[in-house]
Each structure stands twice: as structure tokens, then as C-alpha cells.
Interface confidence: low
């Protein structure tokens, strides 16, 4: 098939913004001699024009010709030709840039069969969902472990989708990992969130030691807690030796002062003395034992012609000290919205953050905060406590950055500052927060919940209430009752069901008259004090066909306490074999008032039940 030789400067690869970035990269020498494994080191890339357009055989091209292909050239090729190109690149060990890999992956529309024939790093850019079967995913992720995951920054969508897919593929449930699991994950183990570090410290900490990028806040806190806890493999900091410090090299930056203080001083001194003679150790040692941001060159002037006139893509080629010297903090503050679109490294972002910190020591203004984007992930809770965030748009913009992740300490602090700044939890704020964090409602105290308007209750889903405790449901239930009051019986029950943990006895009695067939799981979440006064007949009507489930729960609250309150004769009418009711001929006295006055702690229910033998005959009572 003849392919067109003429091609646009940039093809359909990526967004317009990416297109212009690529154009900039080309003009700044993107097509560089890359080091290749086939010995092409230091060779110039051959002229590119039309080189892929019509060769008799792509595999006949030399590594030098293949080295610098632009995205636009690939966008003109058929899928089959793209596959041929990918295989040729792999065979000739051509080292590709991230953009080239992304571009190839974009054009390989269907999941390739011959994974082993493709460039290893190309797999990072393929969608793992395309390899969903157990054999397919195992083959895919076995190859991925050998790829250089760090070609992708941590925030890159391609990287973010790999870890959950890999965990699912290897059958990891929960947060407990084996050594084999960690090995199978390869470089992706460096992305495991803090809960894995907390539960699998013994196997995971030695792996995190060699992760190239910095750990995120969540991982750092978990690693710090695990190291401070003194469990395996390193033991308590007070027992560490110089060899332990060596083994921990990559985790040294996360050690807090409490840990450093508990390491024997002689060990720290010996280790510092030795590491100062070994250049490869100077970086981590400096990181943990001196202030966090250190200028490499204290008062370096900006080189001629390098002063930044605006925040643009050219800055990604600046060294850290050049950014520090050549970017004006005020300029950065006014053009913060541009930072997010530029692929800065973590180290470069640290420099930019430091510049803002110097410009605004009392905390950033909202105009800057709103445009922080991914720089927000670099902020500490201490930084955020200095902010005054009043705009819901600012809150949304920053929550968007953290979307899909668990609530981090930074986000928790941000929300706290926002709500305190507003003085109340209005509907718009609540809607925004529950949209990003479904469990948010249950994270509020009863006092805070009391300011939630009933109209907001309509947006609450059952799973949003999973972590609510009885005191919170006590506040939410009346609001839900008010919100759903105009619905008919069955619809009302569906909506109110998840709030019933806060329902009083009279409402449960009313529900028992409506054939609602409450399931046992809901019944078990009801307030014990609300269940106790219900009669056997009322419970039978309330549960309907589910009443048989009481037998399985007879030893658990509230069923256990309710059984103790019922006459055995009445329980027997259910035909379930429930035992523990009050025998016939006994009188029940409720001494809950007396107990309250005596101040005795009550462990089994709201008021102990005292049964005494009746002195009067049953017939006399009748």
C-alpha cells in the first residue's frame, strides 16, 4: 500500500497543547542522539523527512534512521506499519522518548499479540484493560516488571492505571503483600499507597529503599510510622547499626526528628563520617540531617540571556539553580496557571514551591492557590494551614488534583480550612465534598452535622453512611425523615433504610405496620434502646420473611438484649427455637432509673433487667 509522502508538521497525536509542546521540543533539539543498546551512542539522527513513509521494509532502516521519528510521521502510517515499526525499534534496541512511546501506543489500537517483540517501555503506555484475562494480564505484567516505570511521572494517567490493574492481575486482596507480590509488581511497588506500607512493611520497606522518585506524603507517613514502630526488617531505631543506615539509604529522607533522635548518636556520627567520604551517599545524608531545601549555589547570578520573561516550556531545560536564579517569584505567582501544563520534574517543582514560599511567608493568596494544580501535592498540611480559602471554585480545583485517591492529610487540612473559613457547612460545599469523598458525611461530628440542611440528604447514597456511628445517625435520621416525608410507603422505606440506625422506637413501631420486610443487616444496625420495647409481634411484622434470621443473630446485640426482654412463651410463637426469654410466672422490673442514679457502669444495655419470682400466682394476676 502506497503511503502519502507529504505530511503535516504535527499529526493527530495528542492535544493541541501537546502539539505545541512537541513543536517546541523539536525546535529545542528534541531529536537528540539517544544512547542505544545497539552501540549507536553519540550518532546523529538521520534526516527525518519521509523516512518512514515508503521504505520497502521498515526493518531495513538503520537505528540511526529510526532514532528521531516524530509523532506526525507515525500518524500517517497504517496500524500494520506501526506494528512493524515498533518491532523494528525493539530489534534494534533504539532508545525512545516518552512522547515517541506514547505516540506509538496511541496508534497500536488493538492489544498486540506479540508483546515480547515490542519495545519493553512501550508496554507502559498500553491500556492494561486490554489484557484482562488471567493469562493475558500475567503475560503483560510479567513484561511490565522489566520496563522502566519511571519514564512516566507518578501523576501520569498511564502510570496511575497500571498499579490497580497489576494488583488485580496478581490476585492481591486488601493491603497485605507477600515477598512474591512485591517482586511481581516490579517498579510499580514504588506507587503502593501508605496502607500497603503499614500492613506489609517487612516486605515493602526494603523495596521502597530503591525507588528512584520521592515517596508521596501518604507513603512517607506510613514508612515513618513503620520504622518508628521498630518492627521487622530493621527493628527499633535504638538498635540500628551503620549497616542498617546503609540498607535504609533510599528511605533516609523520610526519617523524622523523633526517629533520628532515637538512633544511637555514635552510629549516626560514624555513618555521617563514613558517608561524607563516599560521594554516592552525600545526597540522602544531606537530605535528612539538614534543612529540607538547600540551594546548591547560594547566590548564583542568572546566566546572560536566561532570565525568564514568562513561564513556558523552555523552563523544563533549566537546571534547579537556574530556575532559582532566573525565575522571578512574582512572575511565577501571576502565571501559576501555566505551571500545570508544563512537564516539570519533582525537583524543579520543589524549586518553584520554594520561590512561592519566599514570596508569601504568611501563606499564599487565593489567586495563586486556585492555580496550584499538581503543585498542591507538594504542599504540607503546615503550608495549607496558612491559607485562607473562601471560593468553592478553588476548593474544587484542588480536590480535582487529588481525585481518585484517598483523602490525604493535605486535602483533610484544606477542607478543614475551607469549612472553618465559611463558618458553616452549606449545601454547595457538602455536595462538592460528598462528590469527591463519599465517606465525608460520616467524618463530621454530630455538631457539624446539625448544620446540614435536610435538602442535602437527597444526595446521600447508602454507602455514604457506612462509617457513620450511632451519634451521627441520631442527627441525620430526623433530617432524612423530613426530607422523604412526602414519599409513599415502599419508596420511603428504600430511602430511609440506611438512616434507620438513628430511628426511635415509635418510628420502628410505625414501620412494622407497613409490611416493609426489613433485612437482618438493617435490623442489626438499629439502636438497641429503640429495639428493646418492640413486642415479638412487632418485630415479626417488621422483618416479615426475614424473621428467621433472628436465630443466627441471637447471641449478638440488639437481638440478644431484645430476647432477654421478651416472654419465652411469646418467643416460642415464632417457632425459631430462640432461648433466653423470661420464663412464665416471672415478673419484670425495669430498674434503669435506679441504675442511672447509682452511677453503675452498664455494659449490656440501656438498663439492666431484674427478674424476680412473682409472689402472686399467675391466676391471681389474671
Amino acid at each position: 500500500m502506497a503511503l502519502p509522502t507529504a505530511r503535516p508538521l504535527l499529526g493527530s497525536c495528542g492535544t493541541p497543547a501537546l502539539g505545541s509542546l512537541l513543536f517546541l521540543l523539536f525546535s529545542l533539539g528534541w531529536v537528540q542522539p539517544s544512547r542505544t543498546l545497539a552501540g549507536e551512542t553519540g550518532q546523529e539522527a538521520a534526516p527525518l523527512d519521509g523516512v518512514l513513509a515508503n521504505p520497502p521494509n521498515i526493518s531495513s532502516l538503520s537505528p540511526r534512521q529510526l532514532l528521531g521519528f516524530p509523532c506526525a510521521e507515525v500518524s500517517g502510517l497504517s496500524t500494520e506499519r506501526v506494528r512493524e515499526l515498533a518491532v523494528a525499534l525493539a530489534q534494534k534496541n533504539v532508545k525512545l522518548s516518552t512522547e515517541q512511546l506514547r505516540c506509538l501506543a496511541h496508534r497500536l489500537s488493538e492489544p498486540p499479540e506479540d508483546l515480547d517483540a515490542l519495545p519493553l517501555d512501550l508496554l507502559l503506555f498500553l491500556n492494561p484493560d486490554a489484557f484482562s484475562g488471567p493469562q493475558a494480564c500475567t503475560r503483560f505484567f510479567s513484561r511490565i516488571t522489566k520496563a522502566n516505570v519511571d519514564l512516566l511521572p507518578r501523576g501520569a494517567p498511564e502510570r496511575q492505571r497500571l498499579l490497580p490493574a497489576a494488583l488485580a492481575c496478581w490476585g492481591v486482596r486488601g493491603s497485605l503483600l507477600s515477598e512474591a507480590d512485591v517482586r511481581a509488581l516490579g517498579g510499580l511497588a514504588c506507587d503502593l499507597p501508605g496502607r500497603f506500607v503499614a500492613e506489609s512493611a517487612e516486605v515493602l520497606l526494603p523495596r521502597l529503599v530503591s525507588c528512584p522518585g520521592p515517596l508521596d506524603q501518604d507513603q512517607q507517613e506510613a514508612a515513618r510510622a513503620a520504622l518508628q514502630g521498630g518492627g521487622p526488617p530493621y527493628g527499633p531505631p535504638s538498635t540500628w547499626s551503620v549497616s542498617t543506615m546503609d540498607a535504609l539509604r533510599g528511605l533516609l529522607p523520610v526519617l523524622g526528628q523523633p526517629i533520628i533522635r532515637s538512633i544511637p548518636q555514635g552510629i549516626v556520627a560514624a555513618w555521617r563520617q563514613r558517608s561524607s567520604r563516599d560521594p554516592s551517599w552525600r545526597q540522602p545524608e544531606r537530605t535528612i540531617l539538614r534543612p529540607r531545601f538547600r540551594r546548591e549555589v547560594e547566590k548564583t547570578a542568572c546566566p546572560s540571556g536566561k532570565k525568564a520573561r514568562e513561564i513556558d516550556e523552555s523552563l523544563i531545560f533549566y537546571k534547579k539553580w537556574e530556575l532559582e536564579a532566573c525565575v522571578d517569584a512574582a512572575l511565577l505567582a501571576t502565571q501559576m496557571d501555566r505551571v500545570n501544563a508544563i512537564p516539570f520534574t519533582y525537583e524543579q517543582l520543589d524549586v518553584l514551591k520554594h520561590k512561592l514560599d519566599e514570596l508569601y511567608p504568611q501563606g499564599y493568596p487565593e489567586s495563586v492557590i486556585q492555580h496550584l494544580g499538581y503543585l498542591f501535592l507538594k504542599m504540607s498540611p503546615e503550608d495549607i494551614r496558612k491559607w485562607n480559602v473562601t471560593s468553592l471554585e478553588t476548593l474544587k480545583a484542588l480536590l480535582e488534583v487529588n481525585k481518585g485517591h484517598e483523602m490525604s492529610p493535605q486535602v483533610a487540612t484544606l477542607i478543614d480550612r475551607f469549612v472553618k473559613g465559611r463558618g458553616q457547612l452549606d449545601k454547595d460545599t457538602l455536595d462538592t465534598l460528598t462528590a469527591f469523598y463519599p465517606g465525608y458525611l460520616c467524618s463530621l461530628s454530630p455538631e457539624e452535622l446539625s448544620s446540614v440542611p435536610p435538602s442535602s440528604i437527597w444526595a446521600v447514597r447508602p454507602q455514604d453512611l457506612d462509617t457513620c456511628d450511632p451519634r451521627q445517625l441520631d442527627v441525620l435520621y430526623p433530617k432524612a425523615r423530613l426530607a422523604f416525608q412526602n414519599m409513599n410507603g415502599s419508596e420511603y422505606f428504600v430511602k430511609i433504610q440506611s438512616f434507620l440506625g438513628g430511628a426511635p422506637t415509635e418510628d420502628l413501631k410505625a414501620l412494622s405496620q407497613q409490611n416493609v420486610s426489613m433485612d437482618l443487616a438493617t435490623f442489626m444496625k438499629l439502636r438497641t434502646d429503640a429495639v428493646l420495647p418492640l413486642t415479638v409481634a412487632e418485630v415479626q411484622k417488621l422483618l416479615g420473611p426475614h424473621v428467621e434470621g433472628l436465630k443466627a443473630e441471637e447471641r449478638h446485640r440488639p437481638v440478644r438484649d431484645w430476647i432477654l426482654r421478651q416472654r419465652q412463651d411469646d418467643l416460642d410463637t415464632l417457632g425459631l427455637g430462640l432461648q433466653g426469654g423470661i420464663p412464665n410466672g416471672y415478673l419484670v422490673l425495669d430498674l434503669s432509673m435506679q441504675e442511672a442514679l447509682s452511677g453503675t457502669p452498664c455494659l449490656l444495655g440501656p438498663g439492666p433487667v431484674l427478674t424476680v419470682l412473682a409472689l402472686l400466682l399467675a391466676s391471681t394476676l389474671a
Partner: nanobody, 115 residues
Framework: VQLVESGGGLVQPGGSLRLSCAAS????????VAWYRQAPGKEREFVAS???????SYADSVKGRFTVSKDKAKDTVYLQMNSLKPEDTAMYSC???????????WGQGTLVTVS
Amino acid sequence: VQLVESGGGLVQPGGSLRLSCAASGSMFSINAVAWYRQAPGKEREFVASINTDGTTSYADSVKGRFTVSKDKAKDTVYLQMNSLKPEDTAMYSCIYCRYDGEFAYWGQGTLVTVS
């Protein structure tokens, strides 16, 4: 979240102390709050914990002598320590587990010396 423990100090055997663990910078509800202690040269050990619903658990060595409680309105958890013994000497720290179980926050600790 910042945790600040207080209430530690020097006390004679048989005496009492009440430790507090206050959380600042957070309005988030908590699943569990636990007290741990670490004596010089020993490993950190669990002392007591309290869940959102108020249920408590204790290490065997402190059962009947220590009581854990909380004041939700003040975001503070207390450890009432009675009949103190010399072996209770340690640095006492509290840990807050966030409601979604995702993060644990440790305090810096408060020193209790029974002598």
C-alpha cells in the same frame, strides 16, 4: 492532623496520672484512638484503645488499672492511670486512625516516670 499528648510527669508507685491526647487541625471523625508506650531499651507496646462507638480494649498488664475515654466535642482522648507501678515508666504516645483507615497519625509522646 497534629496530636499533642500531655499529662505526663513523675509520680510515686500507687499514684495516679491522667494523660490527654488532643487533635488539632482536623474536624474528621476517628475510627480508633490507641495509646502505646515505649520504655527505654524496650519495644513499643500497645496499652489501650477506644473505638468510635466507645468500645475499649486494654493490654493485660494494665487491665483494671487504666481507663481510656474520649470527649468527642473536644477531639481529645484520655488515659486515666491508677495504681501506677515502676514498670509503667515509659514514653506514652497516642495514635489516631482516620475514619477511612487510610492514615495513622502519631503524637510525639509524653513521659511518665513512676519512682
